[in-house]
């Protein structure tokens, strides 16, 4: 089974240019317990919430978002009203959080294409997930300044060093407008949209015992580096932008129970330990 | 296991306000929202709408717009209902809950009459 | 606003047997794109806030007996509690989970025969 990926697109509506609709999906063998939806940056880390959709409970949504919906039973769309006539969202970072099983919280964010026309975004394009373990971020110029040839030639050079571990960069609270080339079983080494995604984080999913009441014993040892999905050893992320976020572990707290997400299985939606209870708030 | 507690029985006279606190414990305050239904005597369920107090982005059904006020205070883990001039059909019990109406408070019992 | 009517408004049914409440909404509960229906049924016994039973029409919420079972699609629904148990006296209510503003139906009063 290939590593999940998610996708992030925001496009203007033609008709209303005060429109802006967010599309977000999740490429991955689970099944999707809950999707957050996100403006200004990532859940939990800056960004305030927009919608939350739950497969069966239903959605939730808050202004400006105006209807939040399932699309297929792997992505969701968002539309949003925007009434201010200065448009701060063509300017503005979404996110969209997929908690899955057993794959873990994925989250990805991207932004309106700085010159978009109305309603000829490109069609949604699947976007790597950036790996802890897997993942490396070249030098911001280069990526400006050498062609596809010499992408390629990185590419096959990365395989032969030791893949360095990524770290939370907060230079740029924006989005990479990556146009990034990163092969993966999902993916084998396509060009993805640059406006398509950005920043993502991965934590892990847990399975343990539910209680009756619907919520599971957890674990009170440390947080762990749990093993992920069998991925190549190398998968470089060649990116222009510093907005890296990189959450691995499963932290816990005493009283924390996120609520379960079917008969016997417990999803850790959140590895963040305090917030990991966004379980099961809807949206309509 | 997440629980709501709510405040105790008020009665109080037409034309006055009420202010119904829920608190919440055994979850992230900020990471859920919080729900307000009433239910008169011997009647249904209504919706009034909910708080997501980490935003504090709020949801109001119509029918109570403008008569009704949802706070929250993060630092105590407590959500406010607040509903101003009221009515004896307004006497009611009100509930908290939470994660589409999984958890829900004890209820309070809110008597208008002159 | 999106109607909820159940229907019998009560019902009366002996100790082992079978109880069906019905549920109908003005509009689909059906989102097409992912084909679930969002429909959840409680029950509120004297003196208590509702219980969360059944949800996207047919999931038992954790805990919730077996006997309880919820089936349906688009605007039609239906909750069987397949042998009734003398802790199953309660009114039961369904209610849309599609849209704002969720809306309950008004109840149906189940008592022992």
């Known amino acids: 089974a290939g590593t999940p990926e998610v996708w992030v697109q925001v496009q203007m509506e033609a008709t209303e240019l005060s429109s802006f609709t967010v599309h977000c999906g999740f490429l991955g063998p689970g099944s999707i317990s809950l999707v957050t939806v996100s403006w200004g940056g990532p859940d939990g880390a800056g960004g305030t919430k927009l919608a939350v959709l739950h497969p069966e409970l239903g959605t939730r949504q808050w202004a400006p978002a105006r209807q939040a919906r399932w699309e297929t039973q792997s992505s969701i769309s968002l539309a949003l009203e925007d009434s201010g006539a200065s448009s701060p969202f063509a300017n503005t970072t979404f996110c969209c959080k997929f908690a899955s099983f057993p794959e873990g919280s994925w989250e990805s964010c991207g932004s309106l294409p700085p010159s978009s026309d109305p309603g000829l975004s490109a069609p949604p394009t699947p976007v790597p997930i950036l790996r802890a373990d897997l993942a490396g971020i070249l030098g911001l110029s280069g990526v400006l300044l050498f062609g596809c040839g010499y992408l390629l030639h990185l590419l096959r050079r990365q395989k032969h060093r030791p893949t360095p571990r990524l770290q939370p960069s907060h230079t740029n609270s924006q989005a990479l407008t990556a146009q990034a080339w990163a092969p993966s079983q999902a993916s084998q080494a396509a060009l993805h949209d640059p406006y398509a995604t950005i920043n993502t984080s991965f934590c892990p999913a847990t399975l343990d015992t539910a209680h009756p009441n619907g919520w599971a014993s957890l674990p009170t040892h440390a947080a762990h580096q749990p093993q992920g999905p069998a991925a190549s050893a190398s998968t470089p992320i060649l990116a222009r932008g510093s907005f890296v976020s990189v959450e691995n572990g499963l932290y816990t707290q005493a009283g924390e129970r996120p609520p379960h997400t079917g008969p016997g299985l417990t999803l850790f939606p959140d590895c963040r330990g305090p917030r990991a209870l966004e379980g099961r708030f809807g949206v309509r | 296991e997440v629980q709501l507690v709510q405040s105790g029985a008020e009665v109080k006279k037409p034309g006055s306000s009420v202010k119904v606190s829920c608190k919440a414990s055994?979850?992230?305050?900020?990471?859920?929202?919080i729900e307000w239904v009433r239910q008169a005597p011997g009647q249904g369920l209504e919706w009034m709408g909910e708080?997501?107090?980490?935003?504090?982005?709020?949801n109001y059904n119509e029918k109570f717009k403008g008569r009704v006020t949802f706070t929250a205070d993060e630092s105590t883990s407590t959500a406010y209902m607040e509903l101003s001039s009221l009515r004896s059909e307004d006497t009611a019990v009100y509930y908290c809950?939470?994660?589409?109406?999984?958890?829900w408070g004890q209820g309070t019992l809110v008597t208008v009459s002159s | 606003d999106i109607v909820m009517t159940q229907s019998p408004d009560s019902l009366a049914v002996s100790l082992g047997e079978r109880a069906t409440i019905n549920c109908k909404s003005s509009?689909?509960?059906?989102?097409?794109?992912?084909?679930?229906?969002?429909l959840a049924w409680y029950q509120q016994k004297p003196g208590q806030p509702p219980k969360l039973l059944i949800y996207?029409?047919?999931t038992r919420e954790s805990g919730v007996p077996d006997r309880f079972s919820g089936s349906g699609s688009g605007t039609d629904f239906t909750l069987t509690i397949s042998s009734l148990q003398a802790e199953d006296v309660a009114v039961y209510y369904c209610?849309?989970?599609?849209?704002?503003?969720?809306?309950f139906g008004q109840g149906t009063k189940l008592e022992i025969k």
């Open positions: 809950s939470s994660y589409w109406f999984a958890y």
């Open positions: 708080i997501l107090p980490g935003s504090n982005s709020t």
């Open positions: 209610q849309n989970a599609h849209s704002y503003p969720p809306t």
């Open positions: 509009q689909s509960l059906l989102n097409s794109g992912n084909q679930k229906n969002y």
């Open positions: 055994g979850g992230t305050f900020s990471s859920f929202s």
């Open positions: 996207g029409a047919s």
